[in-house]
């Protein structure tokens, strides 16, 4: 499911934590199941290049096949190159796996633009710099596929962090995560930390890159500053959530809040940008215009088309107004909120001018399937994917980039009654309620 | 209707400095439409884009020429102007003022341009 | 950085002639990319915007196709008027600054 504006993805460098680091407030510290503290062995276990995709190296089968695996919080099927294809430099070969096991089962995904299929069957899987276990799991072993693999990203497969509802083709197919928990002790929690370039990237650098750490089992405290505030995951399908108020520099979007939730609100480690559902797209763009109306940009740029170049070093930060979503909170009528700076909603594309400019693409989009809180969010924060209570999490990122003027922020609680009416309930129809390709 | 027209010296000595003047009448310079540039063209080659302005004072520069390059806009004379500092021969050409406009993409109007001659 | 590269140089044609020009940019600009029309002595005009839509007072025998990296400007039937010179640009970088080289359409 990452076709149209969904992958490719943006990583880069990881940069010093930057900024203040604020005292670890200790109140929760109780609540965060699994292990508490360093998880050193996990930490920069992702890598990616610009618009390309986040990735984790994983072993498949036996003797042990080393891919590098998209890591999608959007999807829930783990699914690999089998054959051979011109974007993929390695493959899954299951005849040389002595564990593989054949399920006798097909599997096809198609999105709005290209798909893929696949045979499913299951094997033994690890994740080298990852917890030291080996799980026997569903694989989709991909066949055939279509504008699914992205040529020159690094990445061979897709690992769908997501619940089995979505999962293709059915919810019967238990996903690589359920197989973890279910067969070793690891606590049901993994947590996200995408660090973003922050400038364009020459490839050098960007084959180069450090793009983040997937820590599988609990909360690596030095990823984050700050404190964790936890939003509830409304439904076990996606990660769901409930955004209850929408901000632009400040101001209310002032909008019924159930269009914020418009047919859903997911965190999705596989999209890039964050998607808004179409009249609230309309108005925050019209908000973030009139905020940096000093200079004006073509409308190809606002529709995340075209991009704009500064002189190298001479982006106008100051001009670009910062986003805040608020989130339902844990406690009954109390939100907090997530704020994020232009240096994550401009996303630095490399190669197209000279490199005397920093040129960027706007990466707020237009949704027809709800808000995605994709990369451009995630890239601000340290995101807890507390399976265990039901709740994700949300910190200001160690590695966020920002500038001396303004940081990424999670604050809160704030008062807001209400909140439930916030959330959107689709109509029940025979149909699959698995969106794919959400264009 | 809309007219642009460059003003200014057509000689200008080696490492002095170049300025051109763009009165636009028919129209307001302060029009939230659109940006105004210059471009120009040495004789009997291409064209090569020097810079833009928006009437707030935002101005977007050629890297190639970015440290010699000032625009500047004047509301209140509903006129833009170019500086280009340290010039050598390389930089005769004829001058273009230009209005761009179909949402700030294209250079969808243009002066008859001026010709200026680097030499002493 | 985006090169514009235009084919051919120089294009000896009749009036009345069918007149095909290229350009050919070194990677994709979607849809953004211009046609200017230059005569001698003369500021160049807008003829094409957004690769094939068709500037204000520009007749119907202009006009332009193509997305990503190929376009081509077609002059259906040549007129007198139209041997000058033609320049593409693309604004897909912007703010806009990178014009191609040109094509020459002479008299044959």
């Known amino acids: 499911t990452h076709l149209g504006i969904r992958l490719p993805l943006r990583s880069g460098l990881a940069g010093p934590p930057l900024g203040l680091r604020l005292p670890r407030e200790t109140d929760e510290e109780s609540e965060e199941p699994g292990r508490r503290g360093s998880f050193v062995e996990m930490v920069d276990n992702l890598r990616g290049k610009s618009g390309q995709g986040y990735y984790v190296e994983m072993t498949v089968g036996s003797p042990p096949q080393t891919l590098n695996i998209l890591v999608d919080t959007g999807s829930s099927n783990f699914a690999v190159g089998a054959a051979p294809h011109p974007f993929l430099h390695r493959y899954y070969q299951r005849q040389l796996s002595s564990t593989y096991r054949d399920l006798r089962k097909g599997v096809y995904v198609p999105y709005t633009q290209g798909k893929w299929e696949g045979e499913l069957g299951t094997d033994l899987v690890s994740i080298p710099h990852g917890p030291n276990v080996t799980v026997r799991a569903n694989i989709a072993a991909i066949t055939e596929s279509d504008k699914f693999f992205i040529n020159g990203s690094n990445w061979e497969g897709i690992l769908g962090l997501a619940y089995a509802e979505i999962a293709r083709p059915d919810d019967s197919l238990e996903p690589f995560f359920d197989s973890l928990v279910k067969q070793t002790h690891i606590p049901n929690i993994f947590s996200l930390q995408l660090c973003g370039a922050g400038f364009p990237l020459n490839q050098t650098e960007a084959l180069a890159s450090v793009g983040g750490s997937m820590i599988i089992g609990g909360i690596d405290h030095s990823l984050y500053t700050g404190r964790l505030w936890y939003t509830p995951i409304r439904r076990e399908w996606y990660y769901e959530v409930i955004i209850v108020r929408v901000e632009i520099n400040g101001q209310d979007l002032k909008m019924d809040c159930k269009e914020y939730n418009y047919d859903k609100s997911i965190v999705d480690s596989g999209t890039t940008n964050l998607r808004l559902p179409k009249k609230v797209f309309e108005a925050a763009v019209k908000s973030i215009k009139a905020a940096s109306s000093t200079e004006k940009f073509p409308d190809g740029f606002w529709l995340g088309e075209q991009l704009v170049c500064w002189q190298a070093g001479t982006t106008p930060w100051n001009i670009f107004p910062v986003i805040s979503l608020y989130l339902m909170g844990e406690v009954t009528n109390q939100s907090f909120r997530i704020t994020i700076l232009p240096q994550q909603y401009l996303r630095p594309v490399e190669d197209v001018a000279t490199s005397q400019d920093d040129c960027y693409k706007f990466a707020v989009s237009q949704s027809s399937t709800g808000t995605v809180m994709g990369a451009v969010i995630m890239e601000g924060f340290y995101v807890v994917f507390d399976r265990a209570r039901k709740r994700i999490g949300f910190a200001v990122s160690a590695c966020h980039v920002h500038d001396e003027f303004r940081t990424a922020a999670v604050e809160g609680p704030f008062v807001t009654a209400d909140m439930e009416d916030c959330g959107y309930n689709i109509p029940q129809t025979d149909e699959s309620t698995l969106m794919t390709g959400r264009a | 209707q809309l007219q642009l027209q460059e003003s200014g010296p057509g000689l200008v000595k080696p490492s002095e400095t170049l300025s051109l003047t763009c009165t636009v009448s028919?129209?307001?310079?302060?029009?939230?439409?659109?940006?105004w540039g210059w471009i120009r063209q040495p004789p009997g080659k291409g064209l090569e884009w020097i810079g833009n302005?928006?009437?707030?004072?935002?101005?977007y520069y050629n890297p190639s020429l970015k440290s010699r390059v000032t625009i500047s806009v004047d509301t209140s004379k509903n006129q833009f102007s170019l500086k280009l500092s340290s010039v050598t021969a390389a930089d005769t050409a004829v001058y273009y003022c230009?209005?761009?406009?179909?949402?700030?993409?294209?250079?969808?109007?243009w002066g008859r341009g001026t010709l200026v001659t680097v030499s002493s | 950085e985006i090169v514009l590269t235009q084919s051919p140089a120089t294009l000896s044609l009749s009036p009345g002639e069918r007149a095909t020009l290229s350009c050919r940019a070194s990677?994709?600009?979607?849809?953004?990319l211009a046609w200017f029309q230059q005569k001698p002595g003369q500021a160049p005009r807008l003829l094409i915007y957004?690769?094939?839509n068709r500037a204000t007072g520009i007749p119907a025998r202009f006009s332009g196709s193509g997305s990503g990296t190929d376009f081509t400007l077609t002059i259906s039937s040549l007129e007198p008027e139209d041997f000058a010179v033609y320049y593409c640009?693309?604004?897909?970088?912007?703010?806009?600054?990178?014009f191609g080289g040109g094509t020459k359409v002479e008299i044959k």
């Open positions: 028919g129209g307001s310079i302060s029009s939230s439409s659109y940006y």
């Open positions: 640009q693309q604004v897909y970088v912007w703010p806009p600054r990178t």
């Open positions: 302005i928006y009437y707030s004072g935002s101005t």
């Open positions: 990677q994709s600009v979607s849809s953004y």
């Open positions: 957004d690769a094939s």
């Open positions: 230009a209005r761009l406009g179909h949402g700030y993409n294209y250079f969808d109007l």
